[in-house]
């Protein structure tokens, strides 16, 4: 079975500073997989930010990086200059 | 047991396209990345670029302009295009299986064709 | 110039220990990339010889090994013999590029 395991539960981020989070792949290849990146905010909304390769929601594309570490079979989701707005909970799913 | 095999013409005039087929004998093509390779007489290894089963690919950035590699699963294959080459671009070129190896936390090469010598002249 | 360093060549005699460097740096092997090293005996394709820095495939004879201190790995041969006389490749991934895969120069080991 596959499983997607983020790297940590709760990441600190300082205003302006770029943020990296990881979602590792657990049981499979991850590059046979298209990887996806949510937010889910305060009003339980679950917002699309990203899927493989180079496809953003409205309005993420420009502070968002999505990308795979395919030698360490994670999912990467950088946050370029993360403000108050980008506060949340971030999942990452994975498709074929 | 595995087989990779190269095919392709041995022999491609400047300014033309390199085009090499690699099949894949012994396990379905899904489950794994597949690479190609190439050597010039002499010299080291050279990555050229890798593409997985869902279609998306990475290319070595000194090659990413001439570059197309696409996968056919029905037919256990994969293939290369180079385009634009010239006499620096003859080399053998290998394909190679690339697994990810969920024990170990390791991807590596494990499997590769016997190579194909591909000569650009006019 | 390849972005993993490794001597041109390296020798010794039949049943001695030789070892291949190679050097990489905070992208490759220091960003906790793991290395494979690689056999390629003259005319051949090459054959996986370690992964993860220290593990050797089904069939791969002890007598071969790999450490990892730093951003730099080693690949030992102990009982040299002389079927062992090959080019030996190191080669890892750089974080630079997605899945940008990199190798050394290659050393060729001489029996004598």
């Known amino acids: 079975a596959i499983e997607l395991v983020p790297e940590h539960q709760t990441v600190p981020v300082s205003i302006g500073v770029p943020a990296t989070l990881r979602c590792s792949m657990k049981g499979e290849a991850i590059g046979n997989y298209y990887i996806n990146w949510y937010r889910k905010t305060q009003g339980n909304t679950m917002t699309f930010i990203y899927r493989e390769k180079d496809i953003y929601g409205p309005g993420f594309k420009d502070n968002f990086q999505g990308d795979i570490d395919i030698a360490k079979n994670l999912a990467v989701l950088k946050i370029l200059a993360p403000s108050e707005r980008d506060e949340g909970s971030y999942y990452c799913a994975c498709d074929t | 047991q595995v087989q990779l095999q190269e095919s392709g013409p041995g022999l491609v005039k400047p300014s033309e396209t390199l085009s090499l087929t690699c099949t894949v004998s012994?396990?379905?093509?899904?489950?794994y990345y597949w690479n190609y390779i190439r050597q010039p007489a002499g010299k080291g290894l050279d990555w050229i670029?890798?593409?997985?089963?869902?279609?998306?690919?990475n290319y070595n950035p000194s090659l990413k302009s001439r570059v197309t590699m696409s996968v056919d699963t029905s037919k256990n294959q994969f293939s290369l295009k180079l385009t634009s080459v010239t006499a620096a671009d003859t080399a053998v070129y290998y394909c190679?299986?690339?697994?990810?190896?969920?024990?170990?936390?390791?991807?590596?090469?494990?499997?590769w064709g016997q190579g194909t010598l591909v000569t650009v002249s006019s | 110039q390849s972005v993993l360093t490794q001597p041109p060549s390296v020798s010794g005699a039949p049943g001695q220990r030789v070892t291949i460097s190679c050097t990489g740096s905070?992208?490759?092997?220091?960003?906790?990339?793991?290395i494979k090293w690689y056999q390629q005996l003259p005319g051949t394709a090459p054959k996986l010889l370690i992964y993860?820095?220290?593990n050797r495939p089904s069939g791969v004879p002890d007598r071969f090994s790999g450490s990892k201190s730093g951003t730099s790995v080693s690949l030992a041969i102990t009982g040299l013999q002389a079927e062992d006389e090959a080019d030996y490749y190191c080669?890892?991934?750089?974080?630079?590029?997605?899945?940008?895969?990199?190798f050394g120069g290659g050393t060729k080991l001489t029996v004598l």
């Open positions: 190679a299986r690339e697994r990810w190896d969920s024990s170990s936390s390791a991807l590596y090469f494990d499997y």
């Open positions: 012994g396990d379905s093509i899904s489950g």
């Open positions: 670029g890798r593409i997985f089963t869902t279609g998306n690919t």
């Open positions: 905070s992208s490759n092997i220091g960003a906790d990339y793991d």
């Open positions: 993860g820095n220290s």
């Open positions: 080669q890892s991934y750089d974080s630079s590029m997605s899945g940008y895969v990199v």
